[in-house]
């Protein structure tokens, strides 16, 4: 019972975590304009992995996608890759874990196979969570570096009276969503791995029984059957197909630029 609960809870936690990783990846607010010196701005800049946006004091929001692949910083590409790998692994892990759930009966699937699948999905969730945490941390590190660099050259003089004020960026909401989601996926994965141990049937040691037949004395020793704990090879050799995780387009509503009545 405890095993089923642990497995089920691990699945739910991982599901929430992966949903969070997907949400964070799609969010525009990975970095937001630092408002420390000026809490009220006429133009508020924020950036995501896929596009950068401006929210004007007029209420309008305009976003511009990064339509270049080669022109983007390598770090941004790396963060994108880590987040996508995290999502893909998480999605596959979810698919595997659905079939591994003890409360779901699929044909005559043995507990050993379920244990194997639970462990596989657990490992996938752990790697997925680590990818998300790594991705978000790399981006956060990039922000911190840029923040101090732009603070150092906050005002660069141009011909005396003209000055260019660099927009400084700080942590956006997506970073916190990503960290929490990655952590949840990681915890869910660990729970799945713990549940796997409980799912695997323990080694049953039967006492040797001697049968004395007339004539020859033959002792039958039913050897202790060792169940696959999931660390060995999958005897069933089942193929797991990824149904292809698709995320819906970002749902964000902006005020219409032509809001006439």
């Amino acid at each position: 019972m405890a095993v089923t609960a642990c497995q089920g809870l691990g699945f739910v936690v991982s599901l929430i975590g992966i949903a969070g990783i997907i949400a964070a990846t799609c969010m525009d607010q990975w970095s937001t304009q630092d408002l420390y010196n000026n809490p009220v701005t006429a133009v508020f800049n924020y950036q995501g992995l896929w596009r950068s946006c401006v929210r004007e004091s007029s209420g309008f929001t305009e976003c511009r996608g990064y339509f270049t692949l080669l022109g983007l910083p390598a770090m941004l590409q790396a963060v994108r890759a880590l987040m996508i790998v995290g999502i893909v692994l998480g999605a596959i892990g979810l698919l595997v874990s659905i079939f591994a759930l003890k409360c779901i009966r699929i044909g005559s699937m043995e507990d050993s196979a379920k244990a194997n699948m639970t462990l596989t999905s657990g490992i996938m969730f752990i790697v997925s969570g680590l990818c998300a945490i790594a991705g978000v941390s790399v981006f956060a590190n990039m922000l911190v570096t840029n923040f101090w660099m732009s603070t150092a050259n906050m005002y660069t003089g141009m011909g005396g009276m003209v000055q260019t004020v660099q927009t400084r960026y700080t942590f956006g909401a997506a970073l916190f969503v990503g960290w929490v989601a990655g952590g949840l996926t990681l915890i869910g994965g660990v729970m799945m791995c713990i549940a796997c141990r409980g799912l695997a049937p323990e080694e049953t040691n039967y006492k040797a029984v001697s049968y004395h037949a007339s004539g020859h004395s033959v002792a039958y020793k039913p050897g202790g059957f060792k169940a696959s704990t999931g660390f060995g090879s999958n005897t069933k050799n089942k193929k797991i197909y990824d149904g292809g995780a698709r995320t819906e387009d970002e749902v964000q509503s902006y005020p219409s630029k032509h809001d006439y009545v």
Partner: antibody, heavy 118, light 113 residues
């Protein structure tokens, strides 16, 4: 069509107060900020502040924080600007204008001339 | 506050000629998020309220004749009237829409020679 209609000209004594109104029509009133801009005789334009009709949130030019108070009456789609402690320097044409994309002012009222004279 | 400086203060142009008005900002008006310049141009005729001509430095407002063109980026902006008409006689203002308080240039008076 979009229209901003302002109240008529006012003549006030120094130290008095005046309340200028700006009635909006032809668009969704609560979706757009309304600005106030003043123009002294023969002078340029000066931004005073703006108000959002939905939550009466305001942004005031620090220069006018003790001079102007912006309020809204959503039931009549009207924005008000009250000017206090009037002085002769406050003699100007006061315009209300709707804020458009790019923080530009796309529709303007016809202007209200406030004359401060003893 | 951002200071907007227009040049020249007044301009006399013959009908059909090109008129150029410059506007210099004390600070960049370019927003990094959408790569747009928050500069607006207005036309004000005597006894009338200002009229929006161009926003985002180069986007013409609806109904504005295409002889009016806005250009520039960062701190240096230009309003060009390709072929001046009699009805273009007015004072032209540039405005910072990038940061509070919104500020206007001192204005450029366009007259017919």
């Amino acid at each position: 069509q979009v229209q901003l209609v302002q109240s008529g000209a006012e003549v006030k004594k120094p130290g008095a107060s005046v309340k200028v109104s700006c009635k909006a029509s032809g668009y969704s009133f609560t979706n757009y900020w309304v600005n106030w801009v003043r123009q002294a005789p023969g002078q340029g334009l000066e931004w005073m502040g703006m108000v959002h009709p939905s939550g009466s949130e305001t942004r005031l030019n620090q220069q006018f924080k003790d001079k102007a108070t912006l309020t809204v009456d959503t039931s009549t789609s009207t924005v008000y600007m009250e000017l206090s402690s009037l002085r002769s320097e406050d003699t100007a044409v006061y315009y209300c204008a709707r804020v458009w994309s790019g923080n530009a002012f796309d529709y303007w009222g016809q202007g209200t001339l406030v004359t401060v004279s003893s | 506050d951002i200071v907007m400086t227009q040049s020249p203060d007044s301009l006399a142009v013959s009908l059909g000629e090109r008129a150029t008005i410059n506007c210099l900002s004390s600070q960049s008006l370019l927003a990094s998020g959408n790569q747009r310049n928050y500069l607006t141009w207005y036309q004000q005729k005597p006894g009338q309220p200002p009229k929006l001509l161009i926003y985002w430095a180069s986007t013409r407002d609806s109904g504005v004749p295409d002889r009016f063109t806005g250009s520039g980026s960062g701190v240096d902006f230009t309003l060009t009237i390709s072929s001046v008409q009699a009805e273009d006689v007015a004072v032209y203002y540039c405005q910072n829409g990038f940061s509070f308080p919104f500020t206007f240039g001192q204005g450029t008076k366009l007259e017919i020679k």
